[in-house]
């Protein structure tokens, strides 16, 4: 039994890191393998992650971690019984994929303005709380070409757009994702989408 693709890990910079790897053949990850991990820290202890299958030869492990700080470094040992298959390390702050924003809501009762709000996925004491920026994706269910992205580069988790920038009388969906420039993170997953019916009063045309 050998590792074909070494484990690569990403952290949510809060409490979970996800490591994925591939074996050289079909493997029952949960019965044959264990991933041991330990924070390099005077008061830390070793933990064991039981991997799950991720395709025939692929394995994935969800590592429960202490609250992350930038200096953290974890040792990783992949075992098959008594055989050490791979040894490595992982700095969560260097491989961050933020959590997805939640609670996306479209407020349509503000005159002819659409107000989209969502929740920051981090608590205020987390470093990423004040460092996230967002991308909002709005698309029409009726017209696949009607697809737009709004970049929200300020900290407030909200977006205002004129309802008239979208077509009236049809349904739209929106979703939002996050990233943090300070740690050069990847984008988060998209939030669940929310749907609304866009309607606004067309201004009378002047002839």
């Amino acid at each position: 039994m050998k590792v074909l693709q070494e484990p690569t890990c990403v952290s949510d910079y809060m409490s979970i890191s996800t490591c994925e790897w591939k074996m050289n053949g079909p493997t029952n990850c949960s019965t044959e393998l264990r991933l041991l991990y330990q924070l390099v820290f005077l008061l830390s202890e070793a933990h064991t992650c039981i991997p799950e299958n991720n395709g025939g030869a692929g394995c994935v492990c969800h590592l429960l971690m202490d609250d992350v700080v930038s200096a953290d470094n974890y040792t990783l040992d992949l075992w098959a019984g008594q055989q050490l298959l791979w040894k490595g390390s992982f700095k969560p702050s260097e491989h961050v994929k933020p959590r997805a924003p939640g609670n996306l809501t479209v407020h349509t009762n503000v005159s002819d303005t659409l107000l989209l709000t969502w929740s920051n996925p981090y608590p205020p004491d987390n470093y990423l709380y004040n460092h996230l920026t967002y991308a909002v994706n709005i698309w029409s269910e009726n017209d696949p070409a009607d697809f737009r992205i709004y970049n929200v580069t300020y900290l407030e988790p909200s977006l205002r757009i004129a309802a008239s920038t979208l077509k009236s009388g049809i349904s739209y969906r929106a979703r939002v994702r996050a990233w943090a420039q300070c740690y050069n993170t990847t984008w988060s997953e998209w939030s669940p989408s929310t749907k609304w019916h866009n309607s606004y009063r067309e201004p009378f045309e002047q002839h």
Partner: antibody
């Protein structure tokens, strides 16, 4: 908002015992190492003890064998049991949350050791 | 045990002046584990700098940290009235644990 609220300080005779408490809120207590740091009157800061999320502990040589740090994650609380107290243990004791450094501190509680 | 020695013991300066505080370690310290704190009378310490040079959230940019190995510096570019306090450096070591310097008092001249 992160808060660390301390209690349990007071006057104790040399050789006596005292238990300090620190209640945490506004963060996930169980995922954080916790510490005690003290400051004798007019002196500098001295690290006393720390406890990891899994219960691993460490002590300064000056308190080893006399002080015991513990935590109750269900109550979001940190404790310091101080036995065989000496005059040189008299200080303001702070609880702190952190790891390699201490971003969050309690308000401090005064322990007076005097006959 | 790693010993941190701060100098000077007391720094007498006027508001608007630049303050340079030194922290010297008895053996090499990882920059990732070097921090600076400010403490005012009757208050708990406040983290200013971590990782030798990163400002903690909410700390004004007049505070900066630098250094590596055994020599570290905290600089306050222009002293404000609220900056007069005692400053401590602190290090963490995987075997020796946590130690503080003895402090530098920045007082009004």
């Amino acid at each position: 908002e992160v808060q660390l609220v301390q209690s349990g300080g007071g006057l104790v005779h040399p050789g006596g015992s005292l238990r300090l408490s620190c209640a945490g809120s506004g963060f996930t207590f169980s995922r954080n190492a916790m510490f005690w740091v003290r400051q004798a009157p007019g002196k500098g800061l001295e690290w006393v003890s720390g406890i990891g999320t899994g219960g691993a502990t460490s002590y300064a040589d000056s308190v080893k064998g006399r002080f015991t740090i513990s935590r109750d994650n269900a109550k979001n609380s940190l404790y310091l049991q101080m036995n065989s107290l000496r005059a040189e243990d008299m200080a303001v004791y702070y609880c702190a949350r952190g790891r390699y450094y201490f971003p969050w501190w309690g308000q401090g509680t005064l322990v007076t050791v005097s006959s | 045990e790693i010993v941190l020695t701060q100098s000077p013991g007391t720094l007498s300066l006027s508001p608007g002046e630049r303050a340079t505080l030194s922290c010297r370690a008895s053996q090499s310290v990882s920059s990732s584990y070097l921090a600076w704190y400010q403490q005012k009378p009757g208050q708990a310490p406040r983290l200013l700098i971590f990782g030798a040079s990163s400002r903690a959230p909410g700390i004004p940019d007049r505070f900066s940290g630098s250094g590596s190995g055994t020599d570290f510096t905290l600089t306050i570019s222009r002293l404000e009235p609220e900056d007069f306090a005692v400053y401590y450096c602190q290090q963490y070591d995987h075997s020796a644990g946590w130690t503080f310097g003895q402090g530098t008092k920045v007082e009004i001249k």
